[in-house]
């Protein structure tokens, strides 16, 4: 199993902990919002399947100037085996559908919760 570093603690983090922390962060950024998440920015919808973490990062990395999701972007990079830069897209994107970041986060959060309950931590 691959262990992920760079989250809440120094050194390796078990995948289950990393996934739980990502879920907690997504919940956190949706709570007690005073303004629309990322000012209502739109991102490409993705297929929530294998390779989802990289696809999610590829979509969210194109949102600039949104401090609320910076930690999420960093955490997703820990799940993605390759470096992702703005403007980079994989075949996992549903390139005909753009949704608000707020909706993207709901979709991602639900999928991650299901993975966590099913014990799929990688």
């Amino acid at each position: 199993l691959t262990c992920l570093g760079g989250f809440a603690s120094p050194g390796p983090v078990p995948p289950s902990t990393a996934l739980r922390e990502l879920i907690e962060e997504l919940v956190n950024i949706t709570q007690n919002q005073k303004a629309p998440l990322c000012n209502g920015s739109m991102v490409w919808s993705i297929n929530l399947t294998a390779g989802m973490y990289c696809a999610a990062l590829e979509s969210l990395i194109n949102v600039s100037g949104c401090s609320a999701i910076e930690k999420t972007q960093r955490m997703l990079s820990g799940f993605c085996p390759h470096k992702v830069s703005a403007g980079q897209f994989s075949s996992l994107h549903v390139r005909d559908t753009k949704i608000e970041v707020a909706q993207f986060v709901k979709d991602l959060l639900l999928h991650l919760k299901k993975l966590f309950r099913e014990g799929q931590f990688n």
Epitope: L26, V27, T30, Q31, Q33, K34, A35, P36, L37, G40, T97, E100, A102, Q103, V105, K106, D107, L109, L110, K113, K114, R117
Partner: antibody, heavy 118, light 109 residues
Framework: QVQLQESGPGLVKPSETLSLTCSVS????????WSWIRQPAGKGLEWIGR???????NYNSSLKSRVTMSIDTSKNQLSLKLSFMTAADTAVYYC????????????WGQGTLVTVSS | SYVLTQPPSVSVAPGQTARITCGGN??????VHWYQQKPGQAPVLVVY???DRPSGIPERFSGSNSGNTATLTISRVEAGDEADYYC????????????FGGGTKLTVV
């Protein structure tokens, strides 16, 4: 504590347009999705549509041609217009807030009864 | 269009466990939310995202979701649990929309 209050006419004539307002207090209207949901007497819940502060909407396909939703962030209000009303549109109309983290509804108004009759 | 099917009624004795089902094509891939509605009142969210509980909702309320069926389970049923219960999902397709089940009347006998 977030509170939602629907207001509008209790009686609408057939073929007329229903106009309802939902006033939100205790929280910002800007950061959530908001929906209108209706319930005919003794029947189940029917989703009418949703709106975000950007003005982007999703409507129930069966009502799409008759529905218009809008949002006024300065007044913390949202509105629903439903045209060409018939007796089948008689129902309690609710506004509800979509949770920030899921597609569930965590806050509801108390509902307002709208009757369509001549 | 996506359809959610609930039994019209479920009866249970006080202290027993009530199970209310919500059927839908591959519903296990969706997030299911459950509401309790008492006469003359607005619905109240009791379970969201299959099995999460909002604050203030007793632990007696729980949910599960897999395959083509989601289930709301109410353990140690009390007289005050008598109400209509609705399941709800968000259908993410080219035409995003919300769907409610037809509702189940829970009677505590």
């Amino acid at each position: 504590q977030v509170q939602l209050q629907e207001s509008g006419p209790g009686l609408v004539k057939p073929s007329e347009t229903l106009s309802l307002t939902c006033s939100v207090s205790g929280g910002s209207i800007s950061s959530y999705y908001w929906s209108w949901i209706r319930q005919p007497a003794g029947k189940g819940l029917e989703w009418i549509g949703r709106i975000y502060m950007t003005g982007r909407t999703n409507y129930n396909s069966s009502l799409k041609s008759r529905v218009t939703m809008s949002i006024d962030t300065s007044k913390n209000q949202l509105s629903l217009k439903l045209s060409f009303m018939t007796a089948a549109d008689t129902a309690v109309y609710y506004c509800a807030r979509e949770s920030g983290s899921s597609y569930s509804y965590d806050y509801w108004g108390q509902g307002t009864l709208v009757t369509v009759s001549s | 269009s996506y359809v959610l099917t609930q039994p019209p009624s479920v009866s249970v004795a006080p202290g027993q466990t009530a199970r209310i089902t919500c059927g839908g094509n591959n519903i296990g891939s969706k997030g299911v939310h459950w509401y309790q509605q008492k006469p003359g009142q607005a619905p109240v969210l009791v379970v969201y995202d299959d099995s999460d509980r909002p604050s203030g909702i007793p632990e007696r309320f729980s949910g599960s979701n897999s395959g083509n069926t989601a289930t709301l389970t109410i353990s140690r049923v009390e007289a005050g649990d008598e109400a209509d219960y609705y399941c709800q999902v968000w259908v993410s397709s080219s035409d995003h929309h919300v769907v409610f089940g037809g509702g189940t009347k829970l009677t505590v006998v």
